[in-house]
């Protein structure tokens, strides 16, 4: 039983545990609130549309609404799409929301609103008004908001949404909001901390404003505050990719010694980009509970060597001191204060962008006894010399990040690890802005129109690698040669990332010998030369190997490539060798008794499987446990007969996407007795099999999107009872007959995708129209994108809303 019309152009989800009915109308080109929204809807999302006005009638029947997301219906000009500039701000008529007695959250960001809406229901706890044109806050505006707990007012006056006047906040304006817990005034050209903030405040965001001084009593009564963000006031502007005005003479944000005295409950303090040169311990004398401190993008290179303030932070878990380098200075080494040793709770330490030449063991001695330390991030430092053996002191670390440095190997075979005969002249380094973009974004916590949650992603390390255990990230360095002595004493490593180096040697199975516990090796973006089939064999516990984007030697003719190196890796589960342009192989077969997943995208199987050359048809046959094989993007305009006979016996998932396939030997699928998923998307197929069930009895998921299919065969899905997912979207299908889509098969489908086809809505389509109206099968985008191309009157119309009343149909046939 359907309790909302199929014509509703929105996704409807039910969250039973929370008794929520969620209607998502994101980006549906709506110019009004659609008809047919279920009356029991609790969460309604209308973001990214073109609804011009809201009135009390808009939500009249929707008495159970708890959350309305009406963002981005008239985005400020500089923030919005140039193709769709909105010149008429969203009109909200008085009383539009007042009848919604269950409404708890209202998001009205990105609508060019001039003022805070009035007549809001007393039930409202969250009001978000970011990216509007509200730049005068008065007591009068806020008197109705006494029950609000979360108020977002950011991005109403900054370079991408200029207001051309100074942002004004009436004295004590927020005091009336006695229940306020979270207040954001970020990105607003605010000149001072608002006076007398509500005492129950838990989170205060004042970042990216033009506050020059924090006065002694600014936070005086905020005894419960847990998060304070003052970043971007008096910013460090060097190399930032946005308009940036520092304070006069690059002076720091002035913070009174006693400004933080009352913040006894503070857990998070962000002072990113405040041009600080020193951090007085006295700021932290009452901050025993501080867990996260961001001091990145300041001028604290010298302070890092003294850092007495660290003594006062016994509960600190995360510390970020990144990008504090002195301009035009390339330090010989890193000077860490002994005070770091007092951070007994520290789990994450980031010091990117300190910029120094040599990492020495004693540089890290203050960290040796930090038993809780899990992440040490020294990326983007232009380190040239580092003896990796020093990390034997850090076995408990989960991540050692040395990515984006200039580490390269030593010239001899001594045990000094990685180093180079570096020039000793002072060089001026400018850290690459794009490497770790979250340090160089104007607002790393900004929300997009599409998502309500904050989108900052912090973990630079490959998550799938990180989950295996202790990780050393050496990606994007200058390593051109590896040898076993480099990894001496690193036997505890589970994951090693060497991606993006210059390694071009012929690995013979000795290079990684000390890494007895290694389970994941990322060797992508190098210049692997697979001369020896013994390559990587010393890694007895290796489960995942990524040798993608190592095309250099594969692109040259006459070079030996031993693709059968896999036979020596006894526990290898997953092998990625994408984008290698592999078009030749010295060994005819790859062999493995353990491998379950092989990614072989972006190679040249079209050459290896050239017609008349049968030598490589069994390339994958001896991968006896292989379940997933991705051979998309291999320029295979056809598949020679014999390919499927040469497939491994246990194959479950096969991807042949993006190959330019013009035809497909459907019958040959009979060779793949266990095949469950077949992806043939983004090809040039024009037909489907006569009867899918004759080709495969095991197939559950068939993906045929983005092909050139014009029609379905008469008995296409007859007896295909095992099929659960069928994607026919973005083809040229004009007609679907009842025989092609037998109901006893379709009713088993979890998902059927039919959008972006070329349906002809003539009388021949009556059964199809009737069926989509009545089926319980989930058909995404049914109301909006399953449309008619003709005839004339029906062009562009949704199939679901067709009224073919002139056609006669005997539905009993």
């Amino acid at each position: 039983f359907r309790w909302f019309p199929k014509t509703l152009p929105c996704e409807v989800k039910v969250n039973i545990p929370e008794a929520h009915v969620i209607v998502d109308c994101t980006d549906k080109h709506l110019t009004e609130i659609p008809e047919g929204i279920p009356t029991n809807t609790t969460n309604l999302t209308l973001t990214i549309n073109h609804i011009p006005s809201i009135s009390p009638d808009s939500f009249r029947r929707l008495n159970h609404l708890e959350e309305i997301d009406l963002r981005c219906n008239c985005v400020p000009v500089l923030l919005g799409s140039k193709a769709n500039v909105c010149t008429k701000r969203l009109q909200i008529r008085p009383g539009s929301f007042s009848g919604l007695s269950d409404l708890k959250a209202l998001y009205l960001d990105g609508n060019q609103l001039l003022e805070i809406p009035q007549d809001l229901p007393s039930s409202l706890h969250l009001l978000s008004l970011e990216a509007n044109n509200i730049f005068s806050i008065t007591k009068e505006n806020l008197t109705e908001l006494v029950n609000i707990e979360t108020l977002y007012l950011g991005q109403n006056c900054y370079y991408r949404n200029p207001c051309n006047v100074s942002y004004s906040i009436e004295k004590d304006a927020f005091l009336v909001m006695r229940n306020l817990k979270v207040l954001s005034l970020k990105d607003n050209n605010v000149t001072a901390v608002p006076t007398t903030l509500p005492p129950n405040l838990l989170e205060l965001y004042l970042y990216n404003n033009i506050i020059k001084k924090i006065q002694e009593n600014d936070f005086n009564n905020l005894n419960e505050l847990q998060v304070l963000d003052l970043s971007g006031n008096c910013p460090r502007c060097y190399n930032v990719p946005y308009p940036c005005t520092p304070c006069e003479n690059n002076s720091p944000l002035q913070i009174h010694d006693n400004a933080f005295n009352s913040l006894t409950e503070l857990k998070v303090l962000r002072l990113h980009s405040n041009s600080l040169q020193h951090v007085p311990p006295t700021w932290f004398k009452n901050m025993n509970k501080l867990q996260e401190l961001d001091l990145s993008q300041n001028f604290l290179a010298k302070e890092i060597g003294d850092a007495k303030f660290l003594h006062f932070l016994p509960s600190l878990i995360q510390l970020d001191l990144s990008f504090n380098f002195e301009l035009q200075v390339y330090r010989a080494s890193m000077n860490l204060s002994q005070a770091f040793s007092s951070l007994k709770s520290l789990k994450i330490l980031r010091i990117r962008g300190y910029v120094f030449k040599e990492l020495k063991s004693f540089n890290l001695s203050p960290l040796h006894n930090l038993q809780n330390l899990e992440v040490l991030d020294l990326g983007t430092n232009f380190i040239k010399i580092a003896n990796l053996s020093m990390f034997k002191q850090f076995k408990r670390l989960k991540v050692i990040d040395l990515s984006v440095n200039k580490i390269s190997p030593s010239g001899d075979s001594s045990e000094v690890g990685f180093c180079s005969n570096a020039r000793t002249s002072v060089e001026s380094y400018e850290p690459q802005v794009l490497e770790q973009l979250h340090y160089f974004r104007y607002d790393k916590y900004a929300r997009s129109c599409r998502f309500k949650n904050k989108e900052a992603s912090f973990m630079s390390v490959n998550e799938s690698c990180y989950k295996y255990g202790q990780t050393l990230d050496l990606s994007k360095n200058s390593i051109f040669f590896v040898k076993s002595s480099d990894f001496q004493h690193l036997s505890f490593l589970k994951c090693l990332n060497l991606s993006g180096n210059l390694i071009s040697q012929t690995l013979n199975g000795s290079e990684f010998q000390p890494l007895a516990e290694l389970r994941y090796l990322d060797f992508s973006n190098n210049r692997l030369d697979l001369l020896h089939s013994t390559a990587f064999e010393e890694l007895h516990k290796l489960e995942v190997l990524d040798i993608s984007s190592n095309s250099h030697y594969f692109q040259s003719e006459g070079i030996t490539h031993m693709l059968n190196f896999t036979k020596n890796l006894k526990v290898l589960q997953k092998l990625m060798m994408n984008d290698n342009d592999i078009s030749s192989s010295t060994s005819r077969t790859m062999e493995s008794e353990s491998l379950r997943t092989l990614e072989f995208r972006g190679n040249h199987l079209d050459v290896l499987w050239r017609e008349g050359d049968n030598r490589y048809l069994q390339l994958f046959k001896n991968l006896l446990k292989l379940e997933e094989l991705d051979i998309s993007k291999n320029s295979l305009s056809f598949l020679p007969s014999g390919v499927f006979d040469g497939m491994p016996p246990n194959l479950k998932n096969l991807s042949l996407a993006k190959n330019g396939l013009k035809s497909f030997s459907w019958k040959k699928l009979q060779c793949l007795k266990n095949l469950e998923t077949l992806d043939l998307s983004h090809n040039q197929l024009t037909t489907v099999p006569e009867r899918l069930s004759n080709c495969s009895r095991s197939l559950k998921n068939l993906i045929l999107k983005n092909n050139q299919i014009r029609s379905l065969t008469k008995y296409f899905l007859q007896d295909a009872f095992q099929l659960r997912y069928l994607d026919l979207s973005s083809n040229k299908i004009q007609m679907i007959q009842k025989t092609s889509f037998p109901e006893n098969v379709l009713n088993n489908l979890k998902m059927l995708l039919l959008h972006h086809n070329r349906f002809l809505c003539t009388c021949d389509a009556v059964w199809f129209v009737w069926w989509v109206n009545h089926t319980e099968v989930t058909i995404p985008y049914l109301a909006t994108d399953v449309t008619c191309v003709g005839p004339g009157a029906h062009k562009g119309q949704s199939v679901i809303s067709l009224d073919l009343y002139t056609c006669e149909l005997d539905l009993t046939n």
Epitope: D257, H278, P280, T282, K285, H311, P314
Partner: antibody, heavy 125, light 107 residues
Framework: EVKLVESGGGLVQPGGSLRLSCTTS????????MEWVRQPPGKRLEWIAA??????????EYSASVKGRFIVSRDTSQNILYLQMNALRAEDTAIYYC????????????????WGAGTTVTVSS | DIVMTQSHKFMSTSVGDRVSITCKAS??????VAWYQQKPGQSPKLLIY???TRHTGVPDRFTGSGSGTDYTLTISSVQAEDLALYYC?????????FGGGTKLEIK
């Protein structure tokens, strides 16, 4: 050479008032926190008042024992620190030292690197 | 307020001896401890701050150590001119507070 010289001590009756001065030289007076520390006869040193530096708006701070009775101030044109003592009690009898906070780039450290020779205050009837 | 306790009011030593003066805080003061020397008839003089950092011009026979609540001032080889009162002081929180002092006497 950095110098601090206290003056203004003497004998005063309980309930009476006294103003101590601390004349400074050899450093930029406005840049430093200045403190008053006293030492009652045979007892430990006791910090009683601070005058913060210019960066911290020359605001003041007091110990609980003198709050409301003593007022610290400074004359930045003459580089003099004052301690106005009112409602004096017998237990205020002590040597009063003027001291300079060691300073951490314009912030207080709450330890004291330069001390005056002290001036004696006796509160007795 | 944080209470600083110097358990020894007097300590007797000989020239050339090594002596250690101790100080205990009523709570963890995170190494924010200073030591002062006060000679008879003079004002206090800063020796050590942050538990172990020697102030400018202080002879290297004076060393400070400690963490948490327990702190020590050590004179590695006592000289006659070291006869004085020694005070510890916490600079962790306001009000800054001093110990009762330890008088070093030369035998």
């Amino acid at each position: 050479e950095v110098k601090l010289v206290e003056s203004g001590g003497g004998l005063v009756q309980p309930g009476g008032s006294l103003r101590l001065s601390c004349t400074t030289s050899g450093f930029t007076f406005s840049d430093f926190y200045m403190e008053w520390v006293r030492q009652p006869p045979g007892k430990r040193l006791e910090w009683i008042a601070a005058s913060r530096n210019k960066r911290n708006d020359h605001t003041t701070e007091y110990s609980a024992s003198v709050k409301g009775r003593f007022i610290v101030s400074r004359d930045t044109s003459q580089n003099i620190l004052y301690l106005q003592m009112n409602a004096l009690r017998a237990e205020d009898t002590a040597i009063y030292y003027c001291a300079r906070d060691a300073d951490y780039y314009g912030s207080s450290t709450w330890y004291f690197d330069v001390w005056g020779a002290g001036t004696t205050v006796t509160v007795s009837s | 307020d944080i209470v600083m306790t110097q358990s020894h009011k007097f300590m007797s030593t000989s020239v050339g001896d090594r002596v250690s003066i101790t100080c205990k805080a009523s709570q963890d003061v995170r190494t924010a401890v200073a030591w002062y020397q006060q000679k008879p008839g003079q004002s206090p003089k800063l020796l050590i701050y942050w538990a172990s950092t020697r102030h400018t011009g202080v002879p290297d026979r004076f060393t400070g150590s400690g963490s948490g609540t327990d702190y020590t001032l050590t004179i590695s080889s006592v000289q006659a001119e070291d006869l004085a009162l020694y005070y510890c002081q916490q600079h962790y929180n306001t009000p800054p507070t001093f110990g009762g002092g330890t008088k070093l006497e030369i035998k």
